[in-house]
């Protein structure tokens, strides 16, 4: 039975050229997290954090993606094309798979503010 809940940073905005932290947190379960996958809106994998192997950043994103903090992901040198959905997938045992969604809006405006609130999708 899956009792856990994924909390995410929800809908966030950040400035073009800036950086942003994508963060998910799994709570309310004692399940063991074996791997966390981070995917972009087009379902391409950005990065994987395997509990045993550590972080793997996919080659296409190595210049602009940094692991962490924690199980989160930092996107750097943001472009307008980075606007869209991002998904964290927690592979756990014995529960199975949990998935969280974050929507990132990259703004041209210099007044864009990065909201860091956590919310349950």
């Amino acid at each position: 039975m899956m009792t856990g809940t994924i909390e995410t940073t929800g809908n966030i905005s950040a400035k073009k050229g800036g950086s942003v932290i994508l963060q998910c947190h799994l709570s309310s379960t004692m399940a063991q997290v074996t791997q966390v996958n981070w995917e972009q809106h087009d379902h391409s994998l950005l990065a994987i954090r395997n509990a045993e192997l550590g972080w793997h950043i996919y080659p296409a994103f190595k210049d602009r993606v940094a692991p962490g903090p924690g199980l989160g992901l930092t996107l750097q040198s943001l472009t307008m094309n980075d606007t869209g959905e991002y998904f964290c997938t927690y592979h756990t045992y014995p529960d199975g798979t949990y998935r969280g969604r974050i929507f990132l809006e990259v703004l041209e405006s210099s007044v864009a503010e990065h909201s860091a609130r956590f919310q349950i999708p």
Epitope: Q32, T34, Q35, T92, Y93, T97
Partner: antibody, heavy 124, light 108 residues
């Protein structure tokens, strides 16, 4: 700390049988894929067989297909390799190794954690 | 079966020097390539996976590169503990998963 301890090796005549065991500790055994990899004396590494976390799926190298059977008992945290119709070319150190992946994440078929190995000698 | 070929068979290097090891696949394995180090009487140790990603705890002097059929393991400045045999292994998503014949890195 992850530990894998193989046992069951020894001297056996050609055509004979042997059952290897690998006792796992220090991690939750159930979800992880496991493999057997062997190394003939003074030679390189050869993947032998792999098994999924549940034990429902198994894979074999052509050189052992039909003669070797991989299995696991998750309640005992133990991996097995039943070896029948043994040949001189099966002489090797047999390692059990843990896959970093699970059924949910997918298996990698690479191995960070290995046992110390057990020597199987097939000779008359 | 995908055949993995390593070269050279033996590499003689002085401590502190750079070592470059090659691995070639008989057909494309994309980036599904790992490198292991093995010392006498010991089990292999995973160094690199996905062709270029260091496994947890592996020193930065080890680096991997390549994709498709041509791969390289570079040890930037050899330490005394790096003298060993190195194996490449392909792990395309279907078996068999094959190793190269190994490269022995010895003290010059």
């Amino acid at each position: 700390e992850v530990q894998l301890l193989e046992s069951g090796g020894g001297l056996v005549q050609p055509g004979g049988s042997l059952r290897l065991s690998c006792a796992a500790s220090g991690f939750t055994f159930g979800p992880y894929g496991m493999s057997w990899v062997r190394q003939a004396p003074g030679k390189g590494l050869e993947w032998v067989s792999a098994i999924s976390g549940s034990g429902a799926s198994t894979w074999y190298a052509d050189s052992v297909k039909g003669r070797f059977t991989i299995s696991r008992d998750n309640s005992k945290n133990t991996l097995y390799l039943q070896m029948n119709s043994l040949r001189a070319e099966d002489t090797a150190v047999y390692y059990c190794a843990k896959d970093p992946g699970t059924h949910y994440s997918g298996y990698y078929y690479i191995w960070r954690y290995w046992g110390q190995g057990t020597l199987v000698t097939v000779s008359s | 079966e995908i055949v993995m070929t390593q070269s050279p068979a033996t590499l003689s290097v002085s401590p502190g020097e750079r070592a470059t090891l090659s691995c070639r696949a008989s057909q494309s394995v994309s980036s599904n390539l790992a490198w292991y180090q093995q010392k006498p009487g010991q089990a292999p140790r995973l160094l690199i996976y996905s062709a270029s990603t260091r496994a947890t705890g592996i020193p930065a002097r080890f680096s991997g590169s390549g994709s498709g059929t041509e791969f390289t393991l570079t040890i930037s400045s050899l330490q005394s503990e790096d003298f060993a045999v190195y194996y490449c292994q392909q792990y395309v998503p279907h078996p068999p998963f094959t190793f190269g014949g190994g490269t022995k890195v010895e003290i010059k």
